[in-house]
């Protein structure tokens, strides 16, 4: 007869794992018992069960409650066992004692290994923000047994380096992303992505990029300056930036205070029907945590009756 | 080669008991264990008791009570009897060898087709 | 009793194309299964045993793969003969249930 196992039997950390042992008999053979041990290199044989054919099954006191039979059906020949909830500890050399009659004694070897699966984390960089040179965007560390693969998934363009620990049962990983910021990236996602014979599927943390930054400002309003004139309503300035995090908006006169009437509505600057006192030079001023910005721009308002009277000198001079 | 040859009868009356004889070749019943299942007519495939090779059986739990299965190793026969038989149990019996760790079935016999019916 | 649920119950493929069954047991099974294969009128025919060890004289086309309560059977570059319909089985605690069979057809 022969003895059929498995040379690795590989289990994930507080799962119950199978131990196989089938004796294949010749015609009439009998498995009388089974012996199970523990058999690491350097150490004695610690006894785990016996399986008697008439007997049942003996379970030593180290293991007491946590190695069973299979459940039946189960075939006279097999004497495989059950280890429950196994353990890092448990991870090593098992070898399996078949007494049978008449053919005697025969034995195989196992290894059992026990997966830890991992638990990454992502760790954010410091603040991004535009300008900077090549920058940590984010670091991802997961630890386990064997040592997991950790990769990046993401759209935007950086460099990746990782390193790793070895500890005794297991190993961590860390792989960390540097990018160069630019305001393209702002609520990019970038995933860290960890592989490991343990999981069913690959684990993935996200992070969403936030870089900071603040646009140059412009004023709109003006394009056409013949509508600035004497009495003309609606008139408004409209300061253009963006940035992140989102700007503030602040209206200034250059040459005195803003005139009576003039309204500031965040990044609007709306004025009642122009007088020639609307005249000046306003100052958009945008800021954010990240930086500051300032526009200035000098509204004339005009007088149609100067400008009539000049078109007719204008005119007579031809 | 490896062959199950089954025989039985194809009507049995209500309540009357079936018995179907699995003869078989190119192994030894001291070497392998042999399964019973009964497939009926278009449905699926239903596990009914084992014999092993040492002559000990495990039986279907909802079956127990009304099957035996029992066999003579100088014949290389194995023998299946189930008791108070129904309309329902009307399908197709299979006997089969227990492969390779003893969980799968390598070889099949024929099958034998059994109607219940009055 | 442990349940086993295969999927899909049928499906139509054409000659060349990979297949892929699964069966989903009720509770770890310890990857004590078989898949079989039965064509209409005869007797079925062992595949994979373990979950993931190919019987003898079965095609290398076919692969068996899965642990816990998980388990599936790929055909590879699937041949006109390889219709008919797929069962699974278990074999952990009584009784020993099939899956409800996958009919596949060739397109």
């Known amino acids: 007869g022969e003895l059929e196992t498995s040379d690795v039997v590989t289990v994930v950390l507080g799962q119950d794992a199978k131990l196989p042992c089938f004796y294949r008999g010749d015609s009439g053979e009998q498995v009388g018992q089974v012996a199970w041990a523990r058999v690491d290199a350097g150490e004695g044989a610690q006894e785990l069960a016996l399986l008697h054919s008439k007997y049942g099954l003996h379970v030593s006191p180290a293991y007491e409650g946590r190695v069973e039979q299979p459940p039946p059906p189960r075939n006279p020949l097999d004497g495989s066992v059950l280890l429950r909830n196994a353990v890092q500890a448990d991870e090593g050399e098992y070898e399996c004692r078949v007494s049978t009659f008449p053919a005697g004694s025969f034995q195989a070897r196992l290894r059992l290994r026990v997966l830890v699966p991992p638990l990454p984390s992502l760790n954010p960089g410091p603040a991004l923000e535009e300008g900077q040179g090549l920058t940590l965007a984010a670091s991802c560390t997961a630890e386990g047994s064997p040592a997991p693969s950790v990769t990046w998934d993401t759209e935007v363009k950086g460099t990746t380096s990782s390193r790793s620990f070895k500890h005794s049962r297991s190993a961590a990983v860390t792989s960390e992303f540097h990018l160069v910021p630019s305001r393209s990236m702002n609520g990019q996602p970038l995933t860290c992505v960890v592989s490991h014979p343990g999981l069913l599927q690959d684990q993935r943390i996200t992070h969403i990029l936030h870089v900071s930054f603040l646009a140059e400002a412009s004023v709109r309003g003006l394009e056409d300056q013949n509508l600035w004139h004497i009495g003309r309503e609606g008139a408004m300035l409209k300061c253009l930036s963006e940035g992140q995090p989102p700007p503030s908006y602040n209206w200034t006169r250059l040459d005195g205070p803003l005139p009576s009437g003039v309204r500031v509505d965040g990044d609007t600057l709306g004025f009642p029907p122009l007088t020639t006192e609307h005249s000046g030079i306003y100052v958009c001023h945008v800021s954010n945590e990240f930086s500051s910005r300032d526009s200035q721009v000098t509204v004339d308002v005009l007088d149609p009756q100067e400008d009539s009277g000049k078109q007719v000198d204008l005119v007579s001079a031809s | 080669q490896v062959q199950l040859k089954q025989s039985g009868p194809g009507l049995v009356q209500p309540s009357q008991s079936l018995s179907i004889t699995c003869t078989v070749s190119?192994?030894?019943?001291?070497?392998?264990?042999v399964n019973w299942v009964r497939q009926p007519p278009g449905k699926g495939l239903e596990w009914l008791g084992v014999?092993?090779?040492?002559?000990?059986?495990d039986y279907n739990a909802a079956f127990i009570s009304r099957l035996s299965i029992s066999k003579d190793i100088s014949k290389s026969q194995v023998f299946f009897k189930m008791n108070s038989l129904q309309a329902d149990d009307t399908a197709k019996y299979y006997c089969a060898r227990e492969g390779y760790d003893g969980y799968a079935m390598d070889y099949w016999g024929q099958g034998t087709s059994v109607t219940v019916s009055s | 009793d442990i349940q086993m649920t295969q999927s899909p119950a049928s499906l139509s493929v054409s000659v060349g194309e990979t297949v892929t069954i699964t069966c989903r047991a009720s509770e770890n099974i310890f990857s004590s299964l078989a898949w079989y294969q039965q064509k209409q009128g005869k007797s079925p025919q062992l595949l994979v045993y373990g979950a993931t060890n190919l019987a003898d004289g079965v095609p290398s086309r076919f692969s068996g793969s899965g642990s816990g309560t998980q388990y599936s059977l790929k055909i590879n570059s699937l041949q006109s003969e390889d219709f008919g319909t797929y069962w699974c089985q278990h074999f952990w605690g009584n009784p020993w249930t099939f899956g409800g069979g996958t009919k596949l057809e060739i397109k």
């Open positions: 190119g192994f030894s019943l001291t070497n392998y264990g």
């Open positions: 014999i092993w090779s040492g002559g000990s059986t």
